[in-house]
């Protein structure tokens, strides 16, 4: 299936022009996205591209600015948010990013009714998270980790939390590890829908072993940065949810929720909450062997000002072929009763799908079902519930936009985004208006992507909110690559794979071939987006076929495929990419003296491993950032794919699967081996690990550290680091430069 | 720019009522209106809002007391004020609820609670 065809004919070809690696590195093929910032049923505020931010109302068709780009730009404020109220707006400034969520800034609050800044009990700064109450003008925030309430944003604070230490104590935001691998967050509190309530967790990490890497700066001493991060086997920070009165914060104090008995009985984690109404709230729990998975609903108790998780509104969940939910435990979409909710969660036949608990798990009424999975619930109103799902045309990576109607009987299913523009779009994502008056689609290809307005009874289009004219007209004279996506059926697993061919591709020639991989758990390489990137490149100008294959272990496609890897990781990843290895090379246009593989993060292990594989099939490759031995990364997501590094578990398996144990494979390959020195992801230590192997091999390698960069190479090292493997992959396929 | 024209103020007893009308020159349809009030030397502070589909909102210190409501066809916004307190004394204003930038406000009409 050709997905974006090149626009390439005879009479054109002299004003047509590949795509340069400067292209990529200036971003100048980047799209737009617009999400509306949603404020009511038919109005959202965005922000001008001269940085007002207007008020749009869908109905009147008016808009208007609430806040000029004088007011921002007098703080320098680079983000905002409104109050639920509309009284007021913080302006966030001096952003300092810290882990992948987390950041710190400082706030000032504007009173629109007055048209100045808030004066008297200003914020303190830097601020960790702040935010406004669902309802009114109330605010939480947390500093130097501990929360903080004000009835107004000109009042005083008043102090819920006090135990707040750095690197011990975090109070609303989370530790390391619960930031990139539970939560996927910045912040750990969570206000009930009319902010009678302030739900919060406590994480307390001071028995976890740190992790301590050099930062060099430009002083004459380097840095050392500590952080508390839990690897496999390793202790694990403790957590505690507390609820607090905000009409009345001194009254009672934060009360703690309790914990369910059979999750309490060993090492768990708090995976998230939901609050149902002000007086009910859910919690979702985990064993630390994240098999089992607990939701309990609690509700709150007037006479004893206490919160009551009963037995009886515990739901179990759990995974006996593999670990509970897919790359996280999915979270519940509560109904208007206030009690059943829908979740997504494995059927008998082993795909993920919507069902709606009523009063047991084992009594769940499945709502979607067959051999394709059901992905994000977007939404429930009284009679519609939407969600996203691959089922159109049974392609794994494609994402349709549903529509179910509860209300009737029986429910009757709709796709809003199927044939809306076929060809062009064919992965969507939503945002929804209160009650889904209306909705946003935002359509990220296979064509140049594409934001809509929608009406949310009728579906009907009602404007495009943003069609990326500028990207089109830009790209009418660039030589694109050929894109399709199709599938190989290998030993009853179906592996499907994207190909990126060069313009002028000609299936009589041969070519050298790249496999770009990431292969973890619950990911999906192979997805119907458009992108203009490094390998768009290396397939326009330098006349590469670059290939992206999902096997065993990614996401999407049934818990067979999904689970296939659980307690082996390491094995099936690389197995099932040599396949699809070997399938291209039977397709007679690779040249099979010509072909590489490389990957970053879970991908550099992966292609580490491929090129450590003995097979014979990698003339060369590069792992950025990879891990090495799974005994080096976090406890959180390596113990649920893993299990524990101990005799009695798994210990056997992670010492098999480490890169290092295949030094002596490196030795007739061109290996690359990349990583950022300030990595607090995936520790530098890895990389530090694999070299030391290699030398103790006497296996040749080239290197190349990034100093004081994180997991992300971001900035100048971004251009460095692929103008490095174009080079290094030009002078591996002998193409010149 | 939305013209706004207040009404409807005047001397009442602590718990007493008043309606104060807001009249919009130019269609205001379906925005979002509030109400505002501001005693001498202090600042103008939000007292109630209303959005096109009618879902209300409304500052701490005067829930259930008062009612903000509309009538699109005549272009007018309502505020029912009931149960006075000598600290509901201000000057009233509405406008669009956030307000605009550059801001537009009325003359406001007077409401004056005598204990």
């Known amino acids: 299936i050709v997905l974006r065809p090149s626009r390439v004919h005879n009479s054109e070809e002299n004003t047509m022009r590949a795509l340069t690696l400067k292209d990529i590195l200036n971003g100048t093929f980047s799209y737009k996205t617009f999400f509306p910032n949603w404020i009511s049923g038919q109005e959202y505020l965005h922000q001008s591209a001269d940085n007002n931010i207007v008020l749009y109302n869908i109905e009147t068709g008016q808009s208007y600015t609430i806040l000029s780009n004088r007011t921002m730009k007098s703080v320098n404020a680079s983000n905002y948010g409104l109050s639920p109220d509309r009284q007021f707006v913080y302006l966030e400034s001096d952003y300092s990013k810290l882990w992948r969520y987390s950041y710190t800034a400082t706030y000032y609050i504007y009173d629109l009714s007055n048209g100045e800044f808030v004066r008297g009990n200003e914020l303190p700064r830097p601020i960790q998270y702040l935010c406004w109450s669902p309802v009114g003008s109330k605010l939480a925030y947390v500093y130097q980790n501990n929360i903080y309430l004000k009835q107004r944003p000109g009042d005083p604070p008043f102090q819920i939390t006090f135990n707040g230490r750095e690197n011990k104590i975090f109070n609303g935001i989370p530790d390391w590890v619960y930031e990139e691998e539970m939560l996927a967050t910045k912040y750990a509190l969570w206000w009930s829908p009319n902010g009678k309530f302030l739900a919060y967790a406590e994480f307390n990490d001071t028995d976890i072993p740190v992790i301590a890497y050099s930062y060099y700066g430009d002083e004459q001493y380097p840095r050392t940065i500590n952080i508390p991060y839990p690897k496999a086997g390793a202790k694990n920070p403790v957590v505690r949810i507390f609820i607090i009165d905000t009409t009345y914060p001194a009254y009672v104090g934060p009360q703690e929720v309790p914990v369910p008995a059979m999750i309490a009985s060993s090492d768990y984690y708090f995976s998230w909450l939901t609050w149902v109404t002000d007086e009910r709230v859910c919690l979702q729990w985990l064993k630390r062997v994240q098999n089992v998975s607990v939701l309990s609903i609690c509700d709150f108790r007037e006479d004893w000002q206490t919160w009551d998780c009963p037995k009886t509104q515990e739901h179990i969940e759990e995974s006996r072929t593999g670990w509970a939910g897919g790359f996280f435990v999915s979270t519940p979409v509560f109904s208007y009763d206030a009690i059943s909710y829908y979740k997504i969660f494995s059927d008998k036949d082993g795909y993920k799908h919507i069902h709606y608990i009523k009063d047991t798990v084992e009594n769940a009424i499945q709502i979607t079902s067959g051999k394709w999975e059901a992905i994000n619930i977007f939404r429930v109103t009284q009679d519609s519930l939407f969600y996203s799902s691959n089922e159109f045309e049974e392609y794994p990576g494609r994402r349709n936009i549903y529509r179910i109607s509860i209300g009737s009987y029986p429910p009757s299913k709709k796709c809003v985004t199927c044939h809306l523009r076929k060809e062009r779009c064919q992965y969507y994502t939503a945002s929804f208006s209160d009650y889904a008056k209306y909705y946003a689609l935002v359509c990220y290809g296979p064509g140049i992507p594409i934001s809509t307005l929608h009406d949310g009874r009728t579906d009907q289009e009602i404007k495009i909110l943003e069609e990326n004219k500028e990207l089109e007209n830009a790209l009418k004279n660039i030589q694109l690559p050929k894109e399709e996506i199709k599938k190989l059926e290998v030993d009853e697993i179906t592996l499907w794979y994207k190909m990126i061919l060069p313009p002028q591709f000609d299936r009589s020639k041969k070519y050298p071939l790249l496999i770009q991989v990431y292969g973890g758990p619950c990911s999906q390489s192979v997805r119907s987006v458009f992108a203009v990137n490094w390998i768009s490149y290396l397939a326009s100008k330098e006349g590469m076929v670059i290939a992206l294959v999902d096997g065993r272990g990614t996401a999407f496609q049934g818990d067979k495929l999904l689970y296939a890897v659980y307690r082996k990781l390491g094995v099936y990843e690389v197995e099932d990419q040599i396949t699809a290895v070997r399938k291209f090379i039977e397709m007679g246009f690779i040249d099979e003296k010509r072909i590489a593989i490389w990957g970053w993060s879970y991908g550099g292990y992966v292609s580490s491993l491929a090129l450590a594989s003995g097979t014979g099939l990698f003339k060369c490759g590069i792992a950025v950032a990879p891990v090495s031995s799974w005994e080096y990364y976090a406890s959180v997501y390596t113990e649920r794919f893993m299990g524990l590094p101990t005799k009695d578990d798994n210990l056997e398996h992670y010492k098999n699967s480490t890169v290092m144990a295949r030094a002596e494979y490196f030795r007739n390959v061109d290996y690359l081996l990349i990583h950022g020195t300030a990595d607090d992801n995936v520790h530098f230590q890895n990389s530090a690990q694999i070299a030391k192997a290699l030398v103790n091999a006497q296996v040749d390698f080239q290197a190349m550290w990034y100093s004081d960069q994180n997991h992300g190479l971001s900035g100048l090292s971004t251009n460095h680091l692929y103008t490095h493997m174009t080079h290094f992959l030009k002078q591996c396929f002998s193409l010149s430069d | 720019q939305v013209q706004l024209q207040e009404s409807g103020g005047g001397l009442v007893q602590a718990g007493g009522s008043l309606r104060l009308s807001c009249v919009a020159s130019?269609?205001?349809?379906?925005?979002?209106m509030g109400w505002y009030r501001q005693v001498p030397g202090k600042q103008r502070e939000w007292v109630a809002g209303?959005?096109?589909?009618?879902?209300?909102m409304y500052t701490e210190s005067v829930k259930g007391r008062f009612t903000i409501s509309r009538d699109n066809a005549e272009n007018t916004v309502f505020l029912q004020m009931n149960n006075l307190k000598s600290e509901d004394t201000a000057v009233y204003y509405c406008?669009?609820?956030?307000?605009?930038?550059?801001?537009?406000w009325g003359q406001g009409t007077q409401v004056t609670v005598s204990s």
């Open positions: 406008n669009l609820w956030p307000p605009s930038r550059p801001d537009y």
């Open positions: 130019g269609t205001i349809s379906s925005g979002a």
């Open positions: 209303i959005t096109g589909s009618r879902t209300t």
